[in-house]
Structures are given as C-alpha cells and as structure tokens.
C-alpha cells in the first residue's frame, strides 16, 4: 500500500556543481496526501543545520510531487556547502538527506573538473 506519510525525495549524497553568478534553484521534492506540510531549508554548519529564514522560496508542482524551491539569484561563492530540507507533518519533523552545492567562482572556472574526470568518479552521479 502506498504510504500516506510525507516523503522527501532527495537522494543520498546528492550534489550540484554550479557557477557563481548564475541563478540556481535547489529543489526539495515533497510527496504528501492531504494538507501540504510546512517545509523549510537549512544549511549545515558542522553538526547543526542553520535555518534559512530570509531567503526566497517557492513551490511548483509536477505530476503528484510538490517541489519546495530555494532560490539563489545569483549563486554566491559562500553558498558552497550542504543543505537539507525538513517538513513538519502532524507534529513530526521529517528531514531529507543532505544535498551539496559545489560553487565554482567564475574567476576560477577553468579549474572545474573535466567531463572525463567526472565520468571516472561515478559516486558523483546525480550529485
């Protein structure tokens, strides 16, 4: 039977390689049955996850999944790091796996890993 619990679909070790100066949308796919839960993003700082209060967020829908989006407009070098989304559902807190942003400064874009390098590092798939 399909679960009616809230589910967050961020795959483990998810990573994104992005350029500073570009816009970027970090998605938290959320599946729920009735009332949409309250979802937040936080950024990992050591063992604590610091809530991102004053950031632009939005929702979008595709099929039967809702995506809670954290907007980076534009991406800044200090956006580098790991993020997690959390959903409050019937007084339960559900946390996603973390997703990591690797921000390359435009000035050092030539130092980005090559496609061949990435292909030889399959654990970076989807990340």
């Amino acid at each position: 039977k399909e679960s009616c619990d809230v589910q967050l679909y961020i795959k483990r070790q998810s990573e994104h390689s992005i350029l500073a100066g570009d816009p970027f949308e970090l998605e938290c796919p959320v599946k729920y049955c009735a009332n949409r839960p309250h979802v937040t993003w936080c950024k990992l700082n050591g063992t604590t996850c610091v809530k991102l209060e004053d950031r632009q967020t939005s929702w979008k829908e595709e099929k039967n999944i809702s995506f809670f989006i954290l907007h980076f407009e534009p991406v800044l070098p200090n956006d580098n790091g790991s993020y997690r989304c959390s959903a409050n559902f019937q007084s339960n807190l559900i946390e996603s796996h973390s997703t990591t942003l690797y921000v390359t400064d435009v000035k050092s874009a030539s130092e980005r890993p090559s496609k061949d390098e990435m292909a030889s590092r399959p654990w970076l798939l989807y990340r």
């Epitope: 795959k11 998810s14 292909a119």
Partner: antibody
Framework: QVQLVQSGAEVKKPGASVKVSCKAS????????MHWVRQAPGQGLEWMGY????????YYADKFQGRVTMTRDNSKNTLYMELSSLRSEDTAVYYC????????????WGQGTTVTVSS | DIVLTQSPSSLSASVGDRVTITCRAS??????????MNWYQQKPGKPPKLLIY???NLDFGIPARFSGSGSGTDFTLTISSLQPEDFATYYC?????????FGGGTKVEIK
C-alpha cells in the same frame, strides 16, 4: 505534455558509428538529467548511462566506456548518444529517458530508435 | 553490479486475477530507510512505462490496482485485479548503485 522524440532507424556496418538524437518538449529540458537504455531483439533492458542537466556529470556503464559518448544541447532541447566501433551485438532499440527526482527512476521514454548492425 | 532476479519469467492469468511478481536483488538496495526499486511495464513495440518508483510509490496516472512493496533485497509488484490492458512484460530496476540494472522481465500472458 512531456514528449521525447527520437531520430529514425539506422542501418550500419560493423566498425561504423551511429549517432541517435532525442528531442524533448513539454518540460524544462535543461533542468533534468537524461538516460540512455537499450534493448536487443527479444531481450531485456540494459542501462547505458546518464548525463546530468548541466553536463557536469556524465556516467557510462563500464560495458560501454570508451565506445559511447552522450551529449546534450540545452539550447535545442536535444540529447545525443553516439556509439562507435559497432558490432552485430549492438543491434537493438535505443531509448532515451528522462530522469525523475534526480536519480530515483526514469519516468518518460522516447519511442525508441532501431539500430541494425549488419555487414 | 547488482543483479536483479525476477520470478516467474512468465505467467498465464485471467482477467480479474491477482498477480504477484517478485524481484530479488543480489545485495540490499536500501539506504537509510529508502528503497531504490522501480517497476516498469512494457508492451510489444512500445517503450517501457514507469509504474512504481522507490519501491511503493505509484507514478502519476497509474491505476491503484498496481502496488509495490518490499525492502532490502526482496520486492514485489502486485496487480490486484488484472485488466485486459495489463497483459505485458514487467521489469524491476534498481537505482541504488551505478550502473543501474534491470531484472530479466516477467511476461504476463492471457490464460
């Protein structure tokens, strides 16, 4: 609605190369990773590899490493797969498929491109 | 690579029957409570169609007679009441580890 339309059937000689295209519509192509899967006549499905939305990650199954090249042109909403050094065992239907939820599954598939390798 | 073994490889059933297909993985495809198992339906001359992802989640538009269950290494696809349009080949597929792999398929035929 989401559509993935692939290029037409190809007949190639052993040792040649083939390039299959996959034109996407009905969704923001540049936001989705894409996969290639093939199916030999009367056989099961075989995953060939993946290319991420922004091409920063490309992964080929070991079996195809060195012979396959996956590329995409986000400005044209088109995905490509080139397979070189063709042999008769490469005769198959080749499918492109959209990645769903960044690495969970493949949710929309092209209609398939038949590649026949014969001397 | 993770090997997926489907059983049976084929079965004959009638409209209205309950049909169960199993898929066993050579190693666990769970991680931290998530099961990375998907099920597809394929009809002759057509591409596969996603039915279920993450072991038990019905893809959008898929009828509720299809359901998926299981964890670790053992997974099941169930069709609660077989309909004429369900006669097809069904594949399991894991996305826990690269390369992604498929089971050998189960052909559901009319009895």
């Amino acid at each position: 609605q989401v559509q993935l339309v692939q290029s037409g059937a190809e007949v190639k000689k052993p040792g040649a190369s083939v390039k299959v295209s996959c034109k996407a519509s009905g969704f923001t192509f540049s936001s989705f990773g894409m996969h290639w899967v093939r199916q030999a006549p009367g056989q099961g499905l075989e995953w060939m590899g993946y290319i991420s939305s922004g091409i920063s990650t490309i992964y080929y199954a070991d079996k195809f490493q060195g012979r396959v090249t996956m590329t995409r042109d986000n400005s044209k909403n088109t995905l490509y797969m080139e397979l070189s050094s063709l042999r008769s065992e490469d005769t198959a239907v080749y499918y492109c498929a959209r990645d769903w939820l960044r690495g969970y599954a493949m949710d929309y598939w092209g209609q398939g491109t038949t590649v026949t390798v014969s001397s | 690579d993770i090997v997926l073994t489907q059983s049976p490889s084929s079965l004959s059933a009638s409209v209205g029957d309950r049909v169960t297909i199993t898929c066993r993985a050579s190693q666990s495809i769970d991680y931290d409570g998530d099961s990375y198992m998907n099920w597809y339906q394929q009809k002759p001359g057509k591409p596969p169609k996603l039915l279920i992802y993450a072991a038990s989640n019905l893809d959008f538009g898929i009828p509720a007679r299809f359901s998926g269950s299981g964890s670790g290494t053992d997974f099941t696809l169930t069709i609660s009441s077989l309909q004429p349009e369900d006669f097809a080949t069904y594949y399991c597929q894991q996305s826990n580890e690269d390369p992604w792999t498929f089971g050998g398929g189960t052909k559901v035929e009319i009895k």
